[in-house]
Structures are given as C-alpha cells and as structure tokens.
Interface confidence: medium
C-alpha cells in the first residue's frame, strides 16, 4: 500500500503564438481545480477506461478575475498535493490523465458551472520511494508543469511497496525467517497481509492483497468449494459414489453483497453491483466522498445532500451511470442520414457523409458545385454527379467546415498514441519518452535528453525547453 502524490506547479499559456484567452473575466470570476486519474501499466486503454489505480480531486484554487486587456497569466492554483492512495502493490509503470477544470462563480442559476479546460495524458515508469519526477505537458495552447512521486505507507517498503516491515523485536538482528528491511536498518521483513476477507482456512497469499485458494476452494475470497471433475452437476449434492467435494450453495445464494448490492454469478464466482456510496468486492466499504475521486471520464463530483448519497457524479455528454463509468452509444440512434457513418467522439457526435451528401447529419443532398461553396478557403471539384471540396490545410469534411483530425498527421513521436480532444490533441507517450509530442527520451536517471541549450540557458533544465 502507498500513496501517489502529484504537485501542480503551474498552469498557464504555453510558449509560442496563439496564447489562450484567460478562462476568467470580471463578469465571470472563476477558480481552477484538478483531477488526476491513474491506471496500472503502460496501457493503451482509451481515456474513458476506469482509473484502476485510483483518482483524486484537488481543492479549489483561489478565485481569479482577469484584468481587462491583460494576457492570460499563470493561473492561481489550489494549495496542497493531489494524493491517490493505492491499496496493493505499486505497478512500477502507470498511465495518468490530469484534467484542469474551471469553476465559474458568476450568477448562474443552480450554482457554479464547471467546464474542462485541458486534459493531458502520459505513460511513465516510476519506482516507489524515489525522488520527485518533474514533467511538463501541453494541451492545446495551455501548459501544465507538475511533479509526482509514489511512496509506500508503513509497514510496506520497496520499489513496489510489496515488502512489509515491522520494528525489530530484538535490538541486534531479525529472526532467521525475517530479513532486515533495507533501508530501514531497525526494521525486519514481516508477513504479508492478504486481501481483506480472504478465508483464513482456505486461502493464503504470497503478495500483499492477494488471495490464493487452497485446493478444493475457489472464488475471490476462497470461500466457494470446488466440485471435482467427476461431478455431473456443479450444484449436485455431495455423494460418496460420485466422489464430489461438497459444492455448497451457489455463489449468490444468501446474497453475499452487503448494503443493498445486487449479486450476479460469474463463471468462477460472483460479482456485486453496489449502490451509490458503497464499493468493494461485497459492497462492504462505505463512505465514498468526492475526495475519493469516484467520478470517471471527466464526470464532476458534487457532495450529496443526504447521507444516502455521499456524492453525485455529473456526467459529461456520452457517459452515464452513478460514476459516469458507462459509455452511452449515441450512434445506436442512427442520427446520420443518407448512409452516413456515425462517430461518437465522446464530447460530440460526428457524421461522416457518403459522397454527394453533407451537413451535420448528412441531411443535405449535393448534386454538383452549382451554387455550392466550400468553406474556409476550400475549392469545389466536380465529378461523378457529386461535388467534393478540396480543403485548405487544417480543414476537412464535405464542405471544409470541419476541423481536420489533429491526429491524422501522426504528431506523436516515438510511437506515442494520439487522442483527439476539443482543446487540441493529447499524446500518450510510449515508455521512455516524454514531452507534449513525446519528442524527448527519458533517461533511466530521470533526466530528459534535450536539445543543446541556447546561449544563456543551463542544459538539463526541462522547464526551459518544453
């Protein structure tokens, strides 16, 4: 067990042209807050997959009001760290998503309004117990500077927080079975703590949080007897003639799910669907609050008004469920007409129209170029009874009205994965690379290989280059 810690250093306009407008104004004062989502491994998972390692929400930052005519500065940040506790081993490699949210404090009916300003993502290698690692990521015209680390919570130690230590019983040395716990010279390696609820009779562990079953038992907590292969029915009664181990009741018999959770059988055991406010294998853990970051996929968490709903997730378009964990298949409604191909981009629906059709839902029938104009500097080309537009760079679609897919040019270097986003694009870098476009290799010592420093700048200072 341990904690992943994230320190946001600055959020503001990135270098170069096209500085963003300030997100706040005298008419609409606002403040920022951040959300971090962690996933184990160097996963190629889509942005909406669950934050399996955990998530956290920062406090709100100071209220900021833009000075008229002033460029957008680095915006005032919330105090403190974002902390994501992890219960099991630290995986060593992880993927992250950091979202910057704006809370508008104007006179909106129904309270403050929230909007996502920027989202950055990346994949990193990180040993627990190591020093802070610094990083810089860009999302469109915004730039986010931050540091992160993973640390073990006692009694766990080691680069994966898998070794457990406890104070020595004798001043001189550990017992023969308990190894010294470097670097804690006065502590000794201690037994593992298995997954909560793991049957002490039928389960054991060789990794923290694990529950391995002794022979004849199965299920996540090793509480379900297994029938032998000679049993005809997996639920059949115990019999000396069939040679079956007593299989006992079905995994959902007696409903093992607490706090109103509903049980469904799985091929090997059971699964509990928990009501809001509860989680865990058997819905036994309660008291989830917004501080636990329970809302996925950019959902916004609001504290519930009554004890039975400790939080409420306001889901962005395209997601639903009590934790915004379910993706809505809006294309199933077949919104694109005339055989258009429907694309659900998460934040918006898009229709890719067949030749001869155009419009947001492919509702316009286009015969030729007569009276037709291609937007944004595009030129009309006739052919085959239909027209098409040859669009200027950066635009696409039937009438050049759509911005081109920012990922089409493969902007992420070194095998980085590109995610299109309404604020621009996000590169999720392959292991060993960092930077807004994954252009910099990361050396094992954590320094990045940067271009030679211009005169007057120190080499090895990533903030000055990215």
């Amino acid at each position: 067990a341990g904690v992943f810690e994230l320190q946001i250093h600055s959020f503001g306009p990135g270098p170069g042209p096209g500085a963003p407008r300030s997100p706040c104004s005298a008419r609409l004062p606002c403040r920022l807050f951040f959300r971090v989502c962690l996933k184990p491994g160097l996963s190629e998972e889509a942005a909406e997959s669950p934050c399996a390692l955990g998530a956290a929400l920062s406090a709100r930052g100071p209220v900021y009001t833009e000075q008229p005519g002033a460029p957008a500065p680095d915006l005032p940040l919330p105090d403190g760290l974002l902390q994501v506790p992890f219960r099991d081993a630290w995986p060593g490699t992880f993927s992250f998503i950091i979202e910057t949210w704006r809370e508008e404090l104007g006179d909106q009916i129904g309270g403050p309004a929230w909007s996502l300003l920027a989202r950055v993502a990346g994949r990193r290698r990180l040993a627990a117990g190591g020093p802070w690692a610094r990083d810089i990521q860009r999302a469109g015209a915004w730039e986010l500077r931050f540091s992160y680390r993973a640390r073990c919570e006692p009694p766990a130690v080691g680069t994966a927080c898998t070794r457990l230590c406890r104070p020595r019983s004798a001043p001189s040395r550990c017992g023969p079975g308990l190894r010294p716990c470097a670097p804690l010279e006065d502590e000794c390696e201690a037994p593992l703590v298995c997954r909560a609820g793991c049957s002490p009779e039928h389960g054991f562990c060789e990794q923290p949080g694990e529950c391995r079953c002794l022979e004849g038992w199965t299920g996540p907590l090793c509480t379900v007897p297994v029938s032998t292969s000679s049993c005809l029915s997996p639920r059949g009664p115990s019999s000396a003639t069939t040679g079956c181990l007593v299989p006992g009741p079905g995994p959902c018999d007696g409903n093992p799910c607490a706090n109103g959770g509903s049980c469904s059988e799985t091929p090997r055991s059971f699964e509990c669907t928990c009501p809001r406010g509860f989680y865990g294998l058997r819905c036994e853990v309660s008291g989830v609050t917004c501080a636990d970051g329970p809302c996925f996929n950019g959902g916004l968490c609001v504290g519930g008004a009554d004890p039975d709903s400790a939080y409420i997730c306001h889901c962005p378009p395209g997601f639903q469920g009590s934790n915004c964990e379910k993706r809505v298949d809006r294309c199933s409604l077949q919104p694109c007409r005339n055989g258009g191909l429907c694309l659900d981009l998460g934040h918006a629906l898009r229709c890719r129209c067949r030749a001869g059709f155009a419009g947001p839902r492919c509702e316009h029938d286009l015969d030729d170029c007569a009276g037709r104009a291609c937007a944004n500097g595009g030129t009309c080309v006739e052919g085959g009874g239909a027209h098409r537009c040859s669009c200027a760079l950066g635009f696409g679609g039937r009438d050049c009205r759509e911005r081109a897919d920012p990922c089409a040019a493969r902007p992420c270097a070194h095998g980085g994965r590109c995610y299109a986003h309404f604020s621009g694009l996000v590169c999720a870098c392959a292991p060993g690379y960092m930077g807004a476009r994954c252009e910099f290799p990361v050396h094992p010592d954590g320094a990045s290989a940067l271009p030679a420093a211009p005169p007057g700048l120190r080499p090895g200072d990533p903030q000055r280059y990215l």
């Epitope: 009694p155 457990l164 406890r166 019983s169 550990c174 017992g175 023969p176 079975g177 308990l178 000794c188 201690a190 037994p191 593992l192 703590v193 298995c194 002490p200 389960g203 054991f204 562990c205 060789e206 391995r212 002794l214 022979e215």
Partner: antibody
C-alpha cells in the same frame, strides 16, 4: 490424498555431505511453500529450512545457515535438502513438511521422515 | 529467536476429563496488520510425524475432533481437550511461525 515421501538419509561421518529428497504427490506442489523439520532422538521438533512456492525465497535456522541448502524442482514435484559439513548434533529424523500456503503459514502435512546419523 | 515455553512438561488426566496445556512466547506472535496470532498446535504420537490440530491460535484444522480447541493472543496460549479420549495420548507442541519458526519443548499427555 497428500503424500510426502523422504529419502536419502543414512549414516555419514562428521564433515561429510548428504542430500535428502522429498517426493510430493496428491496436491499442486508448485502452489505451496515447503519446509524441512528435524527431530533428534527423544527430543523435540526443530525447524531447519523453508522455501517459497516458486523457489525464489529461502529461509534457514541459524544452526544450519551456510551449511544446508534447500531447493525444489516443481517440474518433478520434489523438495531437496543439501547438507554439507555435517556435525554430530545434526543427527535426527528429518521431516519434509508442506505449509498451508506461503512461508508465513502453519505446516499442515508431514512425511514419515528419514533418519540421518552423523557419527564416526 | 522467539522462545516458546510450554507448561507443564507432562500431564496426566482421567478419561473424559478436561486437559489444558499452556504455551508462552518470549514476544508477541500477534501480527497487528491482520490481527492474526501466528501460532499452531501439533499432536505427535510415538513413531509418527506430527499432526496439525490448530492454526491461527484458534482455528481447528479440518477433520480434527471438536473436543480440541485453542485460545489466547499475543504471548499466552492454551490448548484445551474438553473430554480426554484414549487416542489423545501423545506429545503436544505449540509452534510460532511469525518470526522464523520455533517449537515449544513439548508436553507429554497421559491417562491418569
């Protein structure tokens, strides 16, 4: 039915070597930590050494550290104890024993034992 | 090492009577992280290997008669045989498996 059968015991001179084997059957050998426990004639039980399920971690009593080596071959379902620099006080019945799970679990099955006698 | 001390060294009890064996460890075998006592009880009859009776200080091994029970926590533990049977004559050992592994010296149980 869990069965553990020790072999390799016998008479050996002080300073000599012996290798004990334990053939396991009736369970998934590769899932369990294993130990060697000995019992001198007319005396109590003394734990000697242990090894985790995949052989990656070994543990020894101070009295045998540096002289005995525990190992296992999961493909052969066999546990070994290599005993070097034997002393008279190593004379005992040596039991092969299965843990209920990993190292930090009680032993639940024992073999019948093999007698090692160290004498000149 | 953790030293395990059993008392008494030998015990004679009438058939059908209660037998109690005590075991004291030189330091606690309760692991605070999971609140388990890493202590087991074994029975050994002449010419046979030991047999597991109790683990986690109080959990009876499958197939062990319910007249055997274990209790205690930290450093003081007890094995109780509620109604002694003739087949219970044996040497009983307590065993800690938290810090390395050590056994008590054994308690010989006989019929009075």
């Amino acid at each position: 039915q869990v069965e553990l059968v020790e072999s390799g015991g016998g008479l050996v001179q002080p300073g000599g070597s012996l290798r004990l084997s334990c053939a396991a059957s009736g369970f998934t050998f590769s899932s369990y930590a294993m130990s060697w426990v000995r019992q001198a004639p007319g005396k109590g039980l003394e734990w000697v050494a242990a090894i985790n399920s995949n052989g990656g971690n070994t543990y020894y009593a101070d009295s045998v550290k540096g002289r005995f080596t525990i190992s296992r071959d999961n493909s052969k379902n066999t546990l070994y104890l290599q005993m070097n620099s034997l002393r008279a006080e190593d004379t005992a019945v040596y039991y092969c024993a299965r843990h209920r799970g990993g190292f930090y679990y009680a032993v639940d099955y024992w073999g019948q034992g093999t007698l090692v006698t160290v004498s000149s | 090492d953790i030293v395990m001390t059993q008392s008494p060294d030998s015990l004679a009890v009438s058939l059908g009577e209660r037998a109690t064996i005590n075991c004291k460890s030189s330091q606690s075998v309760l692991y605070s992280s999971n609140q388990k006592n890493y202590l087991a009880w074994y029975q050994q009859k002449p010419g046979q290997p030991p047999k597991l009776l109790i683990y986690w200080a109080s959990t009876r091994e499958s197939g062990v008669p319910d007249r055997f029970s274990g209790s205690g926590s930290g450093t003081d533990f007890t094995l109780t045989i509620s109604s002694l049977q003739a087949e219970d004559v044996a040497v009983y050992y307590c065993h800690q498996y938290l810090s390395s592994r050590t056994f008590g010296q054994g308690t010989r149980l006989e019929i009075k």
